[in-house]
Amino acid sequence: KKEDGESTAPTARPKVLRCKCHHHCPEDSVNNICSTDGYCFTMIEEDDSGTPVVTSGCLGLEGSDFQCRDTPIPHQRRSIECCTERNECNKDLHPTLPPLKDRDFVDGPIHHKHHHHHHHHH
């Protein structure tokens, strides 16, 4: 059911989806479970010290296609996977950090180009 004035997107789920959440639990979550009209996700990224951090949770339908496409962010290694096939499906998502690859020589020392893997699972 759609609220008045909402668009009827063909990709909209007919019902609420429950997802596991970790480091990304909204205020209405209970026992590390959140609810969404969109996708469950699991993401791995490096923190400021270069340590891999895994985050999981809910993505609203609006804008989630873009987020699940894992658009590269300059100077940040990360990978995200999304799913909708069942409740808590993101328990079974295990994205990995893309490898560091040498970028072309410029002047001076070697820099690293951050490559990004695109995961968009349904």
Partner: antibody
Framework: QVQLQQPGAELVMPGASVKLSCKAS????????MHWVKQRPGQGLEWIGD????????NYNHKFKGKATLTVDKSSSTAYMQLSSLTSEDSAVYYC??????????WGQGTTLTVSS | DIVMTQSPSSLAMSVGQKVTMSCKSS????????????LAWYQQKPGQSPKLLVY???TRESGVPDRFIGSGSGTDFTLTISSVQAEDLADYFC?????????FGGGTKLEIK
């Protein structure tokens, strides 16, 4: 049209278990959550729990954990709630209700459960 | 658990009068991600099962007469019947679906004078 059919009444002995049914028709069972709600005479409504028929994922009100067990039979489009170790406190009307977004847009007529010897 | 408190517990009105009933939640039902209030209103006529009137605090369910108006945000909500009819004799319940377990208010019994 959407229909949730429930038996009108059940009489059960204290200490026994009962399995209440809710047969869904007029819509695709797996497109909605199925909830169970308790109402004691002259009192308000109490949410027991819900089940997603597509993957049988369940949520329970902590007050009913160990008391209620929710299941679904997709082949017959029927949801079930088993209540165990029955006492007089379990005497009530039990409704099934469906939801897409956690508000209940269709309700069964309710089953009146009487626990008595 | 989120506690839902309804007032008054009962009221008696004459046909054609405006009816207002209140529902308060122990914490905000406004979801910041979409700015929606996760509150519904139900009508339960004597001997019948509840019927959905309003969801997301103010969206009327299809087929519900437009004299039923839901309003409010955060923790304070109101159901208004702009011109009460004899067939509106019923109990009215609010329900939050913001956080599990979903909880209901104690109800407001509407009697017709």
């Amino acid at each position: 049209q959407v229909q949730l059919q429930q038996p009108g009444a059940e009489l059960v002995m204290p200490g026994a278990s009962v399995k209440l049914s809710c047969k869904a028709s007029g819509y695709t069972l797996t497109n909605y959550w199925m909830h169970w709600v308790k109402q004691r005479p002259g009192q308000g409504l109490e949410w027991i729990g819900d089940i997603d028929p597509s993957d049988t994922y369940t949520n329970y009100n902590h007050k009913f954990k160990g008391k209620a067990t929710l299941t679904v039979d997709k082949s017959s489009s029927t949801a079930y709630m088993q209540l165990s170790s029955l006492t007089s406190e379990d005497s009530a009307v039990y409704y099934c209700a469906r939801s897409g977004w956690d508000y209940f847009d269709s309700w069964g007529q309710g089953t009146t459960l009487t626990v008595s010897s | 658990d989120i506690v839902m408190t309804q007032s008054p517990s009962s009221l008696a009105m004459s046909v054609g009068q405006k009816v207002t009933m209140s529902c308060k939640s122990s914490q905000s039902l406004l979801k910041s991600s979409n700015q929606k209030n996760y509150l519904a209103w139900y009508q339960q006529k004597p001997g019948q099962s509840p019927k959905l009137l309003v969801y997301f605090a103010s969206t009327r369910e299809s087929g519900v007469p437009d004299r039923f108006i839901g309003s409010g945000s955060g923790t304070d909500f109101t159901l208004t019947i702009s011109s009460v009819q004899a067939e509106d004799l019923a109990d009215y319940f609010c329900q939050q679906y913001y956080r599990i377990p979903w909880t209901f208010g104690g109800g407001t019994k509407l009697e017709i004078k």
